[in-house]
């Protein structure tokens, strides 16, 4: 199995650790971990194109989209590879993350290693917002925290 980790940090109180594991090269990726310091509710959760945090989370670029698709939800066929939907923070501002995704990979053309994981200010509307921004970002707003996805020990 391939194991990968991402430490999320931002300018504010949001921080977290997210783990990824893929047992087979064409199998699903398990994503789990915890993010704290969020406001209660839904927050967009995406893999972005670049593993570049030199200017903070903005330098991570747009959602990882090697198939020239529009934004969607993780269960949609019409989605960016990096579209992992939302995480949900409780009243204490903690989001316990547990996702299984069959589109991202830890190898091959959809490999997310070396790219940036971002948690956003607002809920991702999963491409259903009815405006142009929805088809690009899901109207998820600013980038609260991010980290480069790297190979774990």
């Amino acid at each position: 199995a391939t194991k990968v980790v991402c430490v999320l940090k931002g300018d504010g109180p949001v921080q977290g650790i997210i783990n990824f594991e893929q047992k087979e090269s064409n199998g699903p990726v398990k994503v789990w971990g915890s993010i704290k310091g969020l406001t209660e509710g839904l927050h967009g959760f995406h893999v972005h194109e670049f593993g570049d945090n030199t200017a903070g989370c903005t330098s991570a670029g747009p959602h990882f989209n090697p198939l020239s698709r529009k934004h969607g939800g993780p269960k949609d066929e019409e989605r960016h590879v990096g579209d992992l939907g939302n995480v949900t923070a409780d009243k204490d501002g903690v989001a316990d993350v547990s996702i299984e995704d069959s589109v991202i990979s830890l190898s091959g053309d959809h490999c997310i290693i070396g790219r940036t994981l971002v948690v956003h200010e607002k809920a991702d509307d999963l491409g259903k917002g009815g405006n142009e921004e929805s088809t690009k970002t899901g109207n998820a707003g600013s980038r609260l925290a991010c980290g480069v996805i790297g190979i774990a020990q």
């Epitope: 194109e49 670049f50 670029g61 747009p62 989209n65 198939l67 020239s68 698709r69 529009k70 066929e77 019409e78 142009e132 690009k136």
Partner: antibody, heavy 116, light 107 residues
Framework: EVQLVESGGGLVQPGGSLRLSCAAS????????MSWVRQAPGKGLEWVAN????????DYVDSVKGRFTISRDNAKNSLYLQMNSLRAEDTAVYYC?????????WGQGTLVTVSS | VIWMTQSPSLLSASTGDRVTISCRMS??????LAWYQQKPGKAPEVLIY???TLQSGVPSRFSGSGSGTDFTLTISCLQSEDFATYYC?????????FGQGTKLEIK
């Protein structure tokens, strides 16, 4: 290997119609947005239309809205462009391309000439 | 509509040269920019998307950079097969638009 092969171009009079086809192979056609992009002789590239993988959404550049219709048949791995009320300014090589927002790979193109 | 200005429209260079092609937008497009190469009588080929991501199979001598309104395609060491016309394209805002092209010719 991805292959896109356009056909259906030719000479047509102003006001006439043509239907372009694009046969796709080498990839899962039903999983991709597809687009038509045109290039007038000696000119640059102009995006014309695109269609969602399941055919449920289409977008058009303003200059062809109401005259051109993009469609697809996923069972036949085929993309189409029905062009009605053709004008001289529609004269171009028409390319089909994979993708809905940026484009590639592309077919070799088919020439449409609108002239009396 | 987002208007795009590519410069120069014609660029003369020699093999081994490093060349840059500029693409300027009428408004910011974040990182939603692609670059294409077209050889005479052939279809365009995508080189780069998302400003700087090389499409599979594209040689590493091609690179892209920029953000907001100003973007650059760089070819670090020109090869004979690189003499062609290059187009930028924005996919930030509908309708998707292309630059007018830069013809790269042998000096």
């Amino acid at each position: 290997e991805v292959q896109l092969v356009e056909s259906g171009g030719g000479l047509v009079q102003p006001g006439g119609s043509l239907r372009l086809s694009c046969a796709a192979s080498g990839f899962t056609f039903s999983s991709f947005w597809m687009s038509w992009v045109r290039q007038a002789p000696g000119k640059g590239l102009e995006w014309v239309a695109n269609i969602k993988h399941d055919g449920s959404e289409q977008d058009y550049v303003d200059s062809v809205k109401g005259r051109f219709t993009i469609s697809r048949d996923n069972a036949k791995n085929s993309l189409y462009l029905q062009m009605n009320s053709l004008r001289a300014e529609d004269t171009a090589v028409y390319y089909c391309a994979r993708g809905g927002i940026w484009f590639g790979p592309w077919g070799q193109g088919t020439l449409v000439t609108v002239s009396s | 509509v987002i208007w795009m200005t590519q410069s120069p429209s014609l660029l003369s260079a020699s093999t081994g040269d490093r060349v840059t092609i500029s693409c300027r937008m009428s408004q910011g497009i974040s990182s939603y920019l692609a670059w294409y190469q077209q050889k005479p009588g052939k279809a365009p080929e995508v080189l780069i998307y998302a400003v700087s991501t090389l499409q599979s199979g594209v040689p590493s001598r091609f690179s892209g950079s920029g953000s907001g309104t100003d973007f650059t395609l760089t070819i670090s060491c020109l090869q004979s097969e690189d003499f062609a016309t290059y187009y930028c394209q924005q996919y930030y805002s509908f309708p998707y638009t292309f630059g007018q092209g830069t013809k790269l010719e042998i000096k």
